[in-house]
Protein backbone atom coordinates (compact mmCIF):
# COMPACT_ATOMS: atom_id res chain seq x y z
CA UNK A 1 0.00 0.00 0.00
CA UNK A 2 1.23 3.50 -0.87
CA UNK A 3 1.25 5.53 2.32
CA UNK A 4 3.58 8.35 1.28
CA UNK A 5 2.78 11.92 0.34
CA UNK A 6 4.69 14.42 -1.78
CA UNK A 7 5.01 17.97 -0.60
CA UNK A 8 5.97 20.47 -3.29
CA UNK A 9 6.67 24.17 -3.59
CA UNK A 10 3.20 24.45 -5.11
CA UNK A 11 2.27 27.35 -7.36
CA UNK A 12 5.25 29.65 -7.71
CA UNK A 13 6.24 32.67 -9.73
CA UNK A 14 9.58 34.14 -10.66
CA UNK A 15 11.02 36.96 -12.73
CA UNK A 16 12.17 36.59 -16.29
CA UNK A 17 15.96 36.20 -16.35
CA UNK A 18 16.01 34.97 -12.77
CA UNK A 19 16.19 31.48 -11.32
CA UNK A 20 13.91 29.27 -9.27
CA UNK A 21 14.24 26.09 -7.22
CA UNK A 22 11.72 23.35 -7.88
CA UNK A 23 11.49 21.22 -4.76
CA UNK A 24 9.55 18.09 -3.83
CA UNK A 25 9.75 16.08 -0.64
CA UNK A 26 8.44 12.55 -0.11
CA UNK A 27 7.31 11.78 3.41
CA UNK A 28 5.25 9.27 5.43
CA UNK A 29 6.83 6.24 3.81
CA UNK A 30 9.89 4.08 4.41
CA UNK A 31 10.08 3.18 0.73
CA UNK A 32 13.50 3.48 -0.92
CA UNK A 33 13.74 6.13 -3.63
CA UNK A 34 15.42 4.55 -6.66
CA UNK A 35 15.09 7.46 -9.10
CA UNK A 36 13.53 10.91 -9.36
CA UNK A 37 12.53 12.23 -12.78
CA UNK A 38 11.81 15.91 -13.38
CA UNK A 39 9.46 16.59 -16.28
CA UNK A 40 8.04 19.69 -17.90
CA UNK A 41 4.84 18.75 -19.69
CA UNK A 42 6.05 15.85 -21.89
CA UNK A 43 9.75 16.70 -21.72
CA UNK A 44 12.25 15.02 -19.43
CA UNK A 45 14.47 17.69 -17.87
CA UNK A 46 16.58 15.65 -15.49
CA UNK A 47 17.02 12.37 -13.69
CA UNK A 48 18.53 11.72 -10.29
CA UNK A 49 19.33 8.03 -9.98
CA UNK A 50 20.13 6.68 -6.50
CA UNK A 51 23.23 4.82 -7.72
CA UNK A 52 24.31 6.72 -10.82
CA UNK A 53 23.62 10.34 -9.90
CA UNK A 54 22.24 13.26 -11.88
CA UNK A 55 21.66 13.31 -15.63
CA UNK A 56 20.49 16.49 -17.35
CA UNK A 57 18.80 16.73 -20.74
CA UNK A 58 21.23 18.13 -23.35
CA UNK A 59 18.53 20.63 -24.35
CA UNK A 60 18.54 22.12 -20.85
CA UNK A 61 22.09 21.57 -19.57
CA UNK A 62 22.96 25.28 -19.80
CA UNK A 63 19.89 26.35 -17.81
CA UNK A 64 19.21 23.51 -15.39
CA UNK A 65 21.32 22.69 -12.35
CA UNK A 66 20.87 19.67 -10.09
CA UNK A 67 19.77 20.23 -6.51
CA UNK A 68 19.55 21.26 -3.83
CA UNK A 69 18.94 17.68 -2.73
CA UNK A 70 16.53 16.00 -5.12
CA UNK A 71 15.26 19.38 -6.29
CA UNK A 72 16.05 21.18 -9.52
CA UNK A 73 17.22 24.74 -10.16
CA UNK A 74 16.03 26.49 -13.32
CA UNK A 75 18.15 29.45 -14.43
CA UNK A 76 17.86 32.26 -16.99
CA UNK A 77 14.09 31.95 -16.93
CA UNK A 78 11.99 32.96 -19.93
CA UNK A 79 8.22 33.35 -20.27
CA UNK A 80 8.27 30.05 -22.21
CA UNK A 81 9.23 28.31 -18.96
CA UNK A 82 5.76 29.06 -17.60
CA UNK A 83 3.82 25.84 -17.07
CA UNK A 84 3.53 22.61 -15.13
CA UNK A 85 6.50 20.70 -13.75
CA UNK A 86 6.35 17.24 -12.28
CA UNK A 87 8.63 15.40 -9.88
CA UNK A 88 8.19 11.66 -10.31
CA UNK A 89 9.54 9.58 -7.44
CA UNK A 90 10.17 5.93 -8.30
CA UNK A 91 10.28 3.97 -5.06
CA UNK A 92 10.59 0.42 -3.85
CA UNK A 93 8.37 -1.22 -2.83
CA UNK A 94 5.66 1.45 -2.99
CA UNK A 95 5.82 2.37 -6.67
CA UNK A 96 5.54 5.82 -8.22
CA UNK A 97 4.64 9.10 -6.50
CA UNK A 98 4.08 12.29 -8.51
CA UNK A 99 4.16 15.90 -7.39
CA UNK A 100 3.03 18.90 -9.45
CA UNK A 101 4.41 22.45 -9.45
CA UNK A 102 3.05 25.31 -11.52
CA UNK A 103 5.59 27.97 -12.42
CA UNK A 104 4.66 31.36 -13.78
CA UNK A 105 7.49 33.48 -15.18
CA UNK A 106 6.65 37.16 -14.96
CA UNK A 107 8.01 40.12 -16.93
CA UNK A 108 7.91 42.45 -13.93
CA UNK A 109 9.18 42.26 -10.36
CA UNK A 110 5.88 41.17 -8.82
CA UNK A 111 6.90 37.51 -8.55
CA UNK A 112 5.92 35.88 -5.29
CA UNK A 113 6.02 32.36 -3.96
CA UNK A 114 2.70 30.53 -3.73
CA UNK A 115 1.59 28.40 -0.80
CA UNK A 116 2.97 24.93 -0.25
CA UNK A 117 0.53 22.08 -0.81
CA UNK A 118 0.44 18.30 -0.71
CA UNK A 119 -0.41 15.65 -3.25
CA UNK A 120 -1.12 12.20 -1.81
Amino acid sequence: MMTGTIETTGNISAEKGGSIILQCHLSSTTAQVTQVNWEQQDQLLAICNADLGWHISPSFKDRVAPGPGLGLTLQSLTVNDTGEYFCIYHTYPDGTYTGRIFLEVLESSVAEHGARFQIP
Epitope: T34, L52, H55, P58, H90, T96
Partner: antibody, heavy 117, light 106 residues
Protein backbone atom coordinates in the same frame (compact mmCIF):
# COMPACT_ATOMS: atom_id res chain seq x y z
CA UNK B 1 33.90 12.10 -35.53
CA UNK B 2 33.38 10.83 -31.98
CA UNK B 3 35.41 7.72 -31.22
CA UNK B 4 36.15 5.63 -28.13
CA UNK B 5 39.15 3.34 -28.60
CA UNK B 6 39.57 0.54 -26.06
CA UNK B 7 42.67 -1.45 -25.16
CA UNK B 8 43.28 -5.07 -26.23
CA UNK B 9 42.02 -8.41 -24.83
CA UNK B 10 43.14 -9.56 -21.39
CA UNK B 11 43.73 -12.99 -19.91
CA UNK B 12 44.09 -12.97 -16.12
CA UNK B 13 44.24 -15.51 -13.32
CA UNK B 14 41.31 -15.63 -10.86
CA UNK B 15 42.04 -13.30 -7.96
CA UNK B 16 44.09 -10.93 -10.09
CA UNK B 17 43.20 -7.41 -11.24
CA UNK B 18 42.81 -5.97 -14.72
CA UNK B 19 42.99 -2.36 -15.90
CA UNK B 20 41.22 -1.38 -19.12
CA UNK B 21 41.57 1.88 -21.03
CA UNK B 22 39.26 3.92 -23.26
CA UNK B 23 40.70 6.78 -25.30
CA UNK B 24 38.19 9.40 -26.42
CA UNK B 25 38.49 11.64 -29.48
CA UNK B 26 36.30 13.90 -31.60
CA UNK B 27 34.62 15.78 -28.74
CA UNK B 28 35.40 17.70 -25.55
CA UNK B 29 36.25 14.89 -23.13
CA UNK B 30 35.17 16.76 -19.99
CA UNK B 31 31.65 17.51 -21.28
CA UNK B 32 30.27 13.96 -21.14
CA UNK B 33 30.28 11.23 -18.51
CA UNK B 34 31.87 7.90 -19.40
CA UNK B 35 30.11 4.68 -18.44
CA UNK B 36 31.53 1.19 -18.21
CA UNK B 37 29.29 -1.76 -19.06
CA UNK B 38 29.62 -5.55 -18.97
CA UNK B 39 28.25 -7.98 -21.55
CA UNK B 40 28.11 -11.74 -21.06
CA UNK B 41 26.73 -14.17 -23.66
CA UNK B 42 22.91 -14.42 -23.67
CA UNK B 43 22.62 -11.85 -20.87
CA UNK B 44 21.56 -8.24 -20.79
CA UNK B 45 24.17 -5.51 -20.82
CA UNK B 46 24.94 -4.51 -17.26
CA UNK B 47 26.08 -1.10 -16.03
CA UNK B 48 29.17 -1.10 -13.81
CA UNK B 49 29.57 2.60 -13.13
CA UNK B 50 30.11 6.13 -14.32
CA UNK B 51 32.85 8.73 -14.12
CA UNK B 52 32.63 12.46 -14.80
CA UNK B 53 35.95 13.46 -16.39
CA UNK B 54 35.28 17.10 -15.47
CA UNK B 55 35.71 16.46 -11.74
CA UNK B 56 36.66 12.78 -11.39
CA UNK B 57 33.48 11.96 -9.50
CA UNK B 58 32.51 8.29 -9.69
CA UNK B 59 29.25 6.37 -9.28
CA UNK B 60 28.77 2.61 -9.09
CA UNK B 61 25.97 0.10 -9.00
CA UNK B 62 26.05 -1.82 -5.70
CA UNK B 63 27.36 -5.03 -7.26
CA UNK B 64 30.63 -3.40 -8.37
CA UNK B 65 31.12 -0.78 -5.65
CA UNK B 66 33.91 -2.62 -3.86
CA UNK B 67 35.76 -4.09 -6.87
CA UNK B 68 35.73 -1.48 -9.63
CA UNK B 69 37.86 1.66 -9.74
CA UNK B 70 37.23 4.33 -12.37
CA UNK B 71 39.73 7.06 -13.21
CA UNK B 72 40.47 9.47 -16.05
CA UNK B 73 43.46 11.31 -17.45
CA UNK B 74 42.14 14.53 -18.97
CA UNK B 75 45.45 15.40 -20.62
CA UNK B 76 45.27 12.22 -22.72
CA UNK B 77 41.43 12.08 -22.91
CA UNK B 78 41.50 8.56 -21.52
CA UNK B 79 39.22 6.76 -19.08
CA UNK B 80 40.30 3.69 -17.13
CA UNK B 81 38.54 0.91 -15.27
CA UNK B 82 40.32 -1.41 -12.87
CA UNK B 83 38.48 -4.53 -11.76
CA UNK B 84 39.98 -6.47 -8.85
CA UNK B 85 39.56 -9.97 -7.36
CA UNK B 86 38.59 -11.46 -10.70
CA UNK B 87 36.50 -14.64 -10.86
CA UNK B 88 35.17 -16.68 -13.78
CA UNK B 89 31.96 -14.58 -13.52
CA UNK B 90 34.00 -11.59 -14.68
CA UNK B 91 34.79 -13.26 -18.00
CA UNK B 92 32.94 -10.95 -20.38
CA UNK B 93 33.21 -8.15 -22.92
CA UNK B 94 33.59 -4.73 -21.30
CA UNK B 95 32.51 -1.54 -23.05
CA UNK B 96 33.08 2.09 -22.34
CA UNK B 97 30.36 4.40 -23.62
CA UNK B 98 29.65 8.10 -23.70
CA UNK B 99 26.32 9.23 -22.29
CA UNK B 100 24.46 12.15 -23.85
CA UNK B 101 21.82 13.10 -21.32
CA UNK B 102 20.02 9.86 -20.62
CA UNK B 103 21.32 7.34 -23.15
CA UNK B 104 24.59 6.09 -24.61
CA UNK B 105 25.31 7.59 -28.02
CA UNK B 106 28.86 6.34 -28.72
CA UNK B 107 30.56 3.16 -27.59
CA UNK B 108 34.03 1.68 -27.58
CA UNK B 109 34.57 -1.48 -29.60
CA UNK B 110 34.64 -3.59 -26.43
CA UNK B 111 37.42 -5.62 -24.84
CA UNK B 112 37.31 -9.30 -23.95
CA UNK B 113 38.47 -10.12 -20.44
CA UNK B 114 39.01 -13.77 -19.56
CA UNK B 115 39.57 -14.88 -15.97
CA UNK B 116 40.94 -18.40 -16.08
CA UNK B 117 43.65 -20.48 -14.47
CA UNK C 1 14.38 -1.06 -11.65
CA UNK C 2 12.43 -2.00 -14.75
CA UNK C 3 13.06 -5.38 -16.35
CA UNK C 4 12.88 -5.44 -20.16
CA UNK C 5 11.82 -8.59 -22.00
CA UNK C 6 12.56 -8.85 -25.72
CA UNK C 7 10.85 -11.23 -28.11
CA UNK C 8 11.53 -13.25 -30.04
CA UNK C 9 15.05 -14.08 -28.88
CA UNK C 10 15.88 -15.30 -32.39
CA UNK C 11 14.25 -14.20 -35.64
CA UNK C 12 14.99 -15.39 -39.15
CA UNK C 13 13.67 -13.33 -42.06
CA UNK C 14 14.30 -12.75 -45.75
CA UNK C 15 15.68 -9.71 -47.55
CA UNK C 16 12.80 -7.31 -48.27
CA UNK C 17 10.65 -8.57 -45.37
CA UNK C 18 8.97 -6.22 -42.92
CA UNK C 19 10.33 -7.20 -39.51
CA UNK C 20 8.95 -6.33 -36.06
CA UNK C 21 10.85 -6.72 -32.79
CA UNK C 22 9.19 -6.39 -29.38
CA UNK C 23 10.36 -4.99 -26.04
CA UNK C 24 8.12 -5.14 -22.96
CA UNK C 25 8.75 -3.45 -19.63
CA UNK C 26 7.85 -4.85 -16.22
CA UNK C 27 6.52 -1.34 -15.47
CA UNK C 28 5.61 1.75 -17.45
CA UNK C 29 8.64 2.94 -19.44
CA UNK C 30 6.95 6.27 -20.25
CA UNK C 31 8.40 6.34 -23.79
CA UNK C 32 11.94 6.64 -22.38
CA UNK C 33 13.07 3.79 -24.59
CA UNK C 34 16.08 3.42 -26.89
CA UNK C 35 17.01 0.80 -29.50
CA UNK C 36 20.56 -0.34 -30.30
CA UNK C 37 21.96 -2.53 -33.06
CA UNK C 38 24.99 -4.71 -32.32
CA UNK C 39 26.78 -6.63 -35.05
CA UNK C 40 28.98 -9.56 -34.13
CA UNK C 41 32.24 -8.40 -32.54
CA UNK C 42 31.24 -4.72 -32.73
CA UNK C 43 30.02 -2.01 -30.39
CA UNK C 44 26.30 -1.29 -30.06
CA UNK C 45 25.06 1.47 -32.36
CA UNK C 46 22.27 3.88 -31.41
CA UNK C 47 19.29 3.53 -33.76
CA UNK C 48 16.23 5.07 -32.10
CA UNK C 49 15.88 7.27 -29.00
CA UNK C 50 12.81 8.36 -27.01
CA UNK C 51 10.71 5.57 -28.58
CA UNK C 52 10.38 6.96 -32.11
CA UNK C 53 13.23 9.37 -32.91
CA UNK C 54 15.65 8.19 -35.58
CA UNK C 55 19.30 8.84 -34.75
CA UNK C 56 21.17 10.88 -37.35
CA UNK C 57 22.69 8.73 -40.09
CA UNK C 58 20.40 5.72 -39.50
CA UNK C 59 18.44 4.56 -42.58
CA UNK C 60 14.74 5.47 -42.65
CA UNK C 61 13.70 1.81 -42.94
CA UNK C 62 14.16 1.68 -39.14
CA UNK C 63 11.33 3.04 -37.02
CA UNK C 64 10.18 2.80 -33.43
CA UNK C 65 6.81 2.99 -31.73
CA UNK C 66 5.08 2.19 -28.47
CA UNK C 67 3.90 3.53 -25.12
CA UNK C 68 3.39 2.35 -21.57
CA UNK C 69 5.07 -1.04 -21.26
CA UNK C 70 5.04 -2.16 -24.93
CA UNK C 71 7.51 -1.01 -27.60
CA UNK C 72 8.34 -2.06 -31.14
CA UNK C 73 11.26 -1.68 -33.53
CA UNK C 74 10.25 -2.10 -37.18
CA UNK C 75 12.49 -2.63 -40.20
CA UNK C 76 10.29 -1.87 -43.20
CA UNK C 77 12.38 -3.71 -45.79
CA UNK C 78 15.08 -5.97 -44.42
CA UNK C 79 18.57 -5.59 -45.90
CA UNK C 80 21.49 -8.07 -45.65
CA UNK C 81 23.47 -5.61 -43.49
CA UNK C 82 20.66 -5.63 -40.88
CA UNK C 83 21.77 -9.04 -39.57
CA UNK C 84 22.60 -8.21 -35.93
CA UNK C 85 21.38 -8.37 -32.35
CA UNK C 86 18.96 -5.60 -31.35
CA UNK C 87 18.74 -4.35 -27.76
CA UNK C 88 16.23 -2.09 -26.08
CA UNK C 89 17.21 0.16 -23.15
CA UNK C 90 15.08 2.23 -20.76
CA UNK C 91 15.83 5.07 -18.37
CA UNK C 92 12.43 5.78 -16.78
CA UNK C 93 13.32 3.88 -13.61
CA UNK C 94 16.94 2.79 -13.46
CA UNK C 95 19.04 2.25 -16.58
CA UNK C 96 18.39 -1.25 -17.89
CA UNK C 97 18.76 -3.25 -21.11
CA UNK C 98 16.78 -6.05 -22.65
CA UNK C 99 18.55 -9.33 -23.40
CA UNK C 100 18.32 -8.82 -27.16
CA UNK C 101 16.77 -10.23 -30.32
CA UNK C 102 19.16 -11.89 -32.75
CA UNK C 103 18.04 -11.21 -36.32
CA UNK C 104 19.29 -13.57 -39.00
CA UNK C 105 18.88 -13.34 -42.75
CA UNK C 106 17.42 -16.44 -44.42
Amino acid sequence: EVQLQQSGPELQRPGASVKLSCKASGYTFTEHSIYWLKQRPKQSLEIIGRIDPKNGRTYFVDKFKNRATLTTNTSSNTAYMQLSSLTSEDTAIYFCARIDGFYFDFWGQGVMVTASS
Amino acid sequence: NIHLTQSPSLLSASVGDRVTLSCKGSQNVNKYLVWYQQKLGEAPKLLIYSTDNLQSGIPSRFSGSGSGTDYTLTISSLQPEDAATYFCYQYNNGFTFGSGTKLEIK
